[in-house]
Every structure is written in structure tokens, then in C-alpha cells.
């Protein structure tokens, strides 16, 4: 009997309001045993995959998707989905990324901290297991 897969969660670091040219990292979370995490735009044909997974907590794994220099084209809704053999999960809730012009430059501390969407919200690093972040991406179309 196949298990019911929990919905993933999605969060953004340092937040969902990002100055133009700054970086943002999307964090996707799911259960133990995830093979692939996928970060999708509103169109499911635009996504990035990673198989570089971290052990986030005793009951969860996670992956990270980093955009080094945010542009206006990166604004919009994002969501996560994962593959745990033999099937794909449901999608997470959407998380809206807002990109704003700023006169303070990329380092100005005006991002909105710790935004997330989905059923679970835990700290995104488990210092015990030294695993920290996760990975790069296969493209259907470039997300970043």
C-alpha cells in the first residue's frame, strides 16, 4: 500500500520582498526519503529540479534553490513539489516573490524576513548534521 505523501512547504530566505539585484533562496521541505525537489513558477512548465537533498530534521528533508541576482522577471508566485518513489506529491501553497526597486543598494536591510507557505515551518538548518543547503537545477525553461 502506497503511503499518502504530505504536502511540501515552501519558504524564502531572507524573505519574500527582495531588492533588485539581491539574492533569494527558496527552501522546499518534505518528508524523509525525497529523491527530487522541484521549484515551479505558476506555469508548471517552468521549473528547476534538484536531487541535492539535506536532512533538515528527524522527520523532514529539504532542498534549496538560490537566485543570485533577482530581477523583475523573477517576481511572481512559486511553489514546491517533490518526488518520493514511486510518486509525486501534491504542490505546496504558492509563495509570492516581490521585487522592489531600492535606492539603498543590494545590501539594504529592508527585506521581509522569514516568509513561508505550507503545512510545516521549522528552522531551515540542522547544525547537527552539517548538511545545510541544497542544489542546482534541470530546466524545462529557466527559472532564473
Amino acid at each position: 500500500q502506497e503511503e499518502d505523501l504530505p504536502r511540501p512547504s515552501i519558504s524564502a530566505e531572507p524573505g519574500t520582498v527582495i531588492p533588485l539585484g539581491s539574492h533569494v533562496t527558496f527552501v522546499c521541505r518534505g518528508p524523509v526519503g525525497v529523491q527530487t525537489f522541484r521549484l515551479e513558477r505558476e506555469s508548471r512548465s517552468t521549473y528547476n529540479d534538484t536531487e541535492d537533498v539535506s536532512q533538515a530534521s528527524p522527520s523532514e528533508s529539504e532542498a534549496r534553490f538560490r537566485i543570485d541576482s533577482v530581477s523583475e522577471g523573477n517576481a511572481g508566485p512559486y511553489r514546491c513539489i517533490y518526488y518520493k518513489p514511486p510518486k509525486w506529491s501534491e504542490q505546496s501553497d504558492y509563495l509570492e516573490l516581490l521585487v522592489k526597486e531600492t535606492s539603498g543598494g543590494p545590501d539594504s536591510p529592508d527585506t521581509e524576513p522569514g516568509s513561508s507557505a505550507g503545512p510545516t515551518q521549522r528552522p531551515s538548518d540542522n547544525s547537527h548534521n552539517e548538511h545545510a543547503p541544497a542544489s542546482q537545477g534541470l530546466k524545462a525553461e529557466h527559472l532564473y
Epitope: 529540479d49 534538484t50 541535492d52 541544497a134
Partner: antibody, heavy 120, light 107 residues
Framework: EVQLVETGGGLVQPKGSLKLSCAAS????????MNWVRQAPGKGLEWVAR??????????YYADSVKDRFTISRDDSESMLYLQMNNLKTEDTAMYYC???????????WGQGTSVTVSS | DIQMTQSSSSFSVSLGDRVTITCKAS??????LAWYQQKPGNVPRLLIS???SLETGVPSRFSGSGSGKDYTLSLTSLQSEDVATYYC?????????FGGGTKLEIK
């Protein structure tokens, strides 16, 4: 089909250096963490090093036995994994495997290995 | 570092026997446990991940169980092609560590 082909092994004197290479094909290399695992003759398996992907800033991790002597690196444009081994010791004699992991650390795909012998 | 202990380094078994190989971690590894099979002269093969999940193509006579610190690999009916050394590995924390291996031999 996933293929991992290691090269660069051989006979080297103690305190010498060697660079191992691993050519990867049949999968999307740049979305996977990669590892080196070794096996001394007639012995068990020992994890050596791991490198994460670009979104992790290519973070690297090492076994204590090789820290400060070995360096793992990758070239995503060429789908290559490397292990630079310096100040080699006789106890580094082993078969070295290039391994693609899954699920955050299970060693899912193994190359055929390249043999390293450290002897005077 | 987390130590992985496989209590038996070798087993003498008969074809058709049920075989159980145990692996004990020095601390809780939260089911981040993999089992490998290595036949003589071959490279290791991943059999099971997350303590219980069978990899694609692995015969159903293999199964994994356990939690916390204690884990088990079971073979319901030993076949001649199962003669190999079996290793456990934890991937909860770096450095990843392997058990010393358990070699199955035919009586």
C-alpha cells in the same frame, strides 16, 4: 544509463600527490551532490569526501582521515568530479569510487573505481 | 562521529534459509540508513534507503526494518546469487559512516 568513469589512479610514493577524475554521463550532473568512497584491499567501505551543488555554494565535506590533504572539486560544464590527493600515506592505498548520492546521502550509483597504491 | 556496528562479520548459511543481518548506530540516526550488497570483485549496490525503502530492481526477498539506533536487513529465502558482503551506512550526519560488513557464505 548512469555512467561514472574514474581515472587517474596508480602507484605513488608516500608524501606524493595524485589527482583522480570522474567523468559522469547519463544524468543531470549539476543537480546532484557527488562523493568519493574508498575501499582498502580486503577491507570495508570508507566515505572520503562530498561536494554539494551550486545552490549550496559547492560546499565540501571530508572524512577526518583525509582533511587538509584531499580536495574534492567539480566542473559542472564538463560533468566532471575530481579528487586532488596530496601528502599521500600508505594507508590511503585503496580502490577509489566516484559515487552519486540520493535522498541526501545514500550512495546510489557507483563507478567501477580506480586503484591507488601508495608505496615506496 | 557516529559508529555503525555490524555484530557478525560473517555468516555461514544454507540456500533457502532466512537471513537477518543487524546494524547498530552509536546514536539515533532517524531512519537515515542504507544497505548495500557487494559481490566478490564487484562494486557496491544500493539495496535499501531510509531503512525500509527497497530500490528499484531489488528482489522482494530483501527487506529492511528498524528505527532509532537498531536496524535489520532480512532475506526471506537465500539464493546463490545473494552470496556477498552486506554493508549498512548512516547518512543522518557527516561524516557518513559504514558498518564493517557482514559476509554471507554458503555452508
Amino acid at each position: 544509463e548512469v555512467q561514472l568513469v574514474e581515472t587517474g589512479g596508480g602507484l605513488v610514493q608516500p608524501k606524493g600527490s595524485l589527482k583522480l577524475s570522474c567523468a559522469a554521463s547519463g544524468f543531470t550532473f549539476n543537480i546532484n551532490a557527488m562523493n568519493w568512497v574508498r575501499q582498502a584491499p580486503g577491507k570495508g567501505l570508507e566515505w572520503v569526501a562530498r561536494i554539494r551543488t551550486k545552490n549550496n555554494n559547492y560546499a565540501t565535506y571530508y572524512a577526518d582521515s583525509v582533511k587538509d590533504r584531499f580536495t574534492i572539486s567539480r566542473d559542472d560544464s564538463e560533468s566532471m568530479l575530481y579528487l586532488q590527493m596530496n601528502n599521500l600515506k600508505t594507508e590511503d592505498t585503496a580502490m577509489y569510487y566516484c559515487v552519486r548520492d540520493r535522498y541526501g546521502g545514500a550512495m546510489a550509483y557507483w563507478g567501477q573505481g580506480t586503484s591507488v597504491t601508495v608505496s615506496s | 562521529d557516529i559508529q555503525m556496528t555490524q555484530s557478525s562479520s560473517s555468516f555461514s548459511v544454507s540456500l533457502g534459509d532466512r537471513v537477518t543481518i543487524t546494524c547498530k548506530a552509536s546514536e539515533d540516526i532517524y531512519n537515515r540508513l542504507a544497505w548495500y550488497q557487494q559481490k566478490p570483485g564487484n562494486v557496491p549496490r544500493l539495496l535499501i534507503s531510509s531503512a525500509t525503502s527497497l530500490e528499484t530492481g531489488v528482489p522482494s526477498r530483501f527487506s529492511g526494518s528498524g528505527s532509532g539506533k537498531d536496524y535489520t536487513l532480512s532475506l526471506t529465502s537465500l539464493q546463490s546469487e545473494d552470496v556477498a558482503t552486506y554493508y549498512c551506512q548512516q547518512y543522518w550526519t557527516i561524516p557518513y559512516t559504514f558498518g564493517g560488513g557482514t559476509k554471507l557464505e554458503i555452508k
